[in-house]
Interface confidence: low
């Protein structure tokens, strides 16, 4: 289990939290922050928050944007403050690269 953790870990970051899952809080602590955009019943739903454990965000953060959902992840205090996830536009290709920073 200990071998699974990143080299610099478990540094907790302060992340901006926006969306229903945040309750009354405007921040959360986690090993990764994220900013996401999804389409739900035709509406754009923006969310920001954190993954408590690195493994939680591992697959989500690696997933390339699709027409219905985009997630950008980062590591650093408040690093998701100015990140706004964007859905891919028609004709634009998105390579499946990781969007978060690992030391």
């Amino acid at each position: 289990m200990e071998d699974e953790k990143p080299k610099v870990n478990p540094k907790l970051y302060m992340c901006v939290c926006e969306g229903l899952s945040c309750g009354n809080e405007d921040h959360c602590e986690g090993q990764q922050c994220f900013s996401s955009l999804s389409i739900n019943d035709g509406f754009h739903v923006y969310q920001k928050g954190c993954f408590q454990v690195y493994e939680q965000g591992k697959m989500t953060c690696k997933t390339p944007p699709s027409p219905g959902q985009a997630v950008e992840c980062c590591q650093g205090d408040w690093c998701n403050r100015n990140i706004t996830a964007q859905l891919p536009t028609k004709g634009k290709s998105f390579p499946g690269t990781q969007n978060f920073h690992l030391e």
């Epitope: 610099v8 870990n9 907790l12 302060m14 602590e29 408590q52 980062c74 650093g76 205090d77 920073h101």
Partner: antibody, heavy 119, light 113 residues
Framework: EVQLVESGGGLVQPGRSLRLSCAAS????????MHWVRQAPGKGLEWVSV????????DYADSVKGRFTISRDNAKNSLFLQMNSLRPEDTALYYC????????????WGQGTLVTVSS | DIVMTQSPDSLAVSLGERATINCKSS????????????LAWYQQKPGQPPKLLIY???TRESGVPDRFSGSGSGTDFTLTISSLQAEDVAVYYC?????????FGGGTKVEIK
């Protein structure tokens, strides 16, 4: 006013166990990661363990790994350190410390509780 | 583990004079993505717990007198007391919070000459 009050220290024989408690008040306890830091008599500071606000992330110094267990009860605003298989080198003043909201440094400390491991 | 080395071990300074404490980390504590140095300074007076003075290497904690200042980046850091007061007699510690295990310097004892 933020207050952290440790208890549970005392004289214990090598190999025995002890459970430290830290009662927190004056801040929203379940918003913050909490740490234990110790200080051997006349020596410097040594970080012991951390627990995140929701207990999802826990880590220990190598010197106590496998022997000490950190836990918390957010409903009771309490932090704990279960110390098993105690050694003479564990003799120290044990502080509980509140993590600052911006990083893993400590903006509030308790007064400490003294643990003496001796036969 | 990141090893923190403080110098000198002790320091005797006249009242009103400048006191300078050095702290060196065995590897950089500068986090490139946010340009922050993950380093804090504490003051510990006899019989008391440590008190936070400085974080992010140079940000003074609220309520800390402005005669205390922190500087440095990467691996080399300095805590300066610009004009030593009697109440500044204490042991000062640096701490890195870049990675676990969190580690402290050995401490520098500041006394009045």
């Amino acid at each position: 006013e933020v207050q952290l009050v440790e208890s549970g220290g005392g004289l214990v024989q090598p190999g025995r166990s002890l459970r430290l408690s830290c009662a927190a008040s004056g801040f929203t306890f379940d918003d913050y990661g909490m740490h234990w830091v110790r200080q051997a008599p006349g020596k410097g500071l040594e970080w012991v363990s951390v627990i995140s606000w929701n207990s999802a992330t826990i880590d220990y110094a190598d010197s106590v790994k496998g022997r000490f267990t950190i836990s918390r009860d957010n409903a009771k605003n309490s932090l704990f350190l279960q110390m098993n298989s105690l050694r003479p080198e564990d003799t120290a003043l044990y502080y509980c410390a509140k993590k600052n909201s911006l990083g893993w440094f400590f903006d509030y400390w308790g007064q400490g509780t003294l643990v003496t491991v001796s036969s | 583990d990141i090893v923190m080395t403080q110098s000198p071990d002790s320091l005797a300074v006249s009242l009103g004079e400048r006191a300078t404490i050095n702290c060196k980390s065995s590897q950089s504590v500068l986090y490139s993505s946010n340009d922050n140095n993950y380093l804090a300074w504490y003051q510990q007076k006899p019989g008391q717990p440590p008190k936070l003075l400085i974080y992010w290497a140079s940000t003074r904690e609220s309520g800390v007198p402005d005669r205390f200042s922190g500087s440095g980046s990467g691996t080399d850091f300095t805590l300066t007391i610009s004009s030593l007061q009697a109440e500044d007699v204490a042991v000062y510690y640096c701490q890195q919070y870049y990675s676990t295990p969190l580690t402290f310097g050995g401490g520098t004892k500041v006394e009045i000459k």
